[in-house]
Amino acid sequence: EPPTACREKQYLINSQCCSLCQPGQKLVSDCTEFTETECLPCGESEFLDTWNRETHCHQHKYCDPNLGLRVQQKGTSETDTICTCEEGWHCTSEACESCVLHRSCSPGFGVKQIATGVSDTICEPCPVGFFSNVSSAFEKCHPWTSCETKDLVVQQAGTNKTDVVCGPQDRLR
């Protein structure tokens, strides 16, 4: 009796179970009662990453330098190329099809997490006692200067964008 279901890594065709092609190979011809499934290797710059019955391999992804992309990991016959972004840029999506410039944190905000090839800069507002007076993709919020440790007094209070200004203590007359 012809099978109605096949084992893992097999498929049903013409009332018989044929082996799927292994990753890195494509289907040329189904099996027959005389011969096994005919599979051939994917060509250069092609891949198939699963057990399959595909008659065509997929093209490796192209990391387009015009979009700020570069190769992070070269593809094989079984894996796609992985793209990432040039220094200072990050991917716009998980698939990393294009890149945008890392965001800078404005004055009053500091870098909570430095950007990577796949994630943007994360900024945080400088809390009381901290400031940032530059627009930067790297600088964290800096603590206000401690006037006391310098035997000085606060002459001008700090803000989230400016440091405190210290000055000499008034002498007792």
């Epitope: 289907l27 040329v28 011809s29 027959t32 005919e38 290797p41 060509g43 008659t55």
Partner: antibody, heavy 115, light 111 residues
Amino acid sequence: QVQLVQSGAEVKKPGSSVKVSCKASGGTFSSYAISWVRQAPGQGLEWMGMINPSGGTTSYAQKFQGRVTMTRDTSTSTVYMELSSLRPEDTAVYYCARGFRMDQWGQGTLVTVSS
Amino acid sequence: QSALTQPPSASGSPGQSVTISCTGTSSDVGAYNFVSWYQQHPGNAPKLIIYDTRKRPSGIPDRFSASKSGNTASLTVSGLQADDEADYYCSSYAGNNNLVFGGGTKLTVLG
């Protein structure tokens, strides 16, 4: 069991074209590639190219590039091989066969090129 | 691609073994385990007897065996019989959807 039945013998003049057909029965037509192979009298086998009936994509041996065209008609489960600009040295038996592995063969079609 | 190299002829007596070689390059025989062997009797279409370098289609007797070392594939016919007298061809996948044949070997069964 796949069976491949080819068209009959042809006699052609130099410079003309020939179109040989190969009709498949048994199995699923779109699930195997078809190779074309020729054999000149008293000579060895020569692979000419292949066609993948599922998408119609072709691959031709460098020697025949520009002179050979392989097509398919899914409605009749038939593939065709057309060779143009025929010369006397194209006189041969032309075979179609299943896959690159060529596990089933047509009976062959004799093409004679003579003035 | 240039043809694979086979000896033009080989011979043996009934019951003996004979081996036919098929030499290619590192771009075909050496690169892939996709060598096939065919038997062709005069006036007939070729018949597949070995595929994927060493596998036999069902129905092909185990007197036919094959192997590969480097860029050379070999077909061995053991226990030679009169009906084994035929032409034998090897073929190999050569990458990029291309295939190449050997020039063929005429096997004669003596006696």
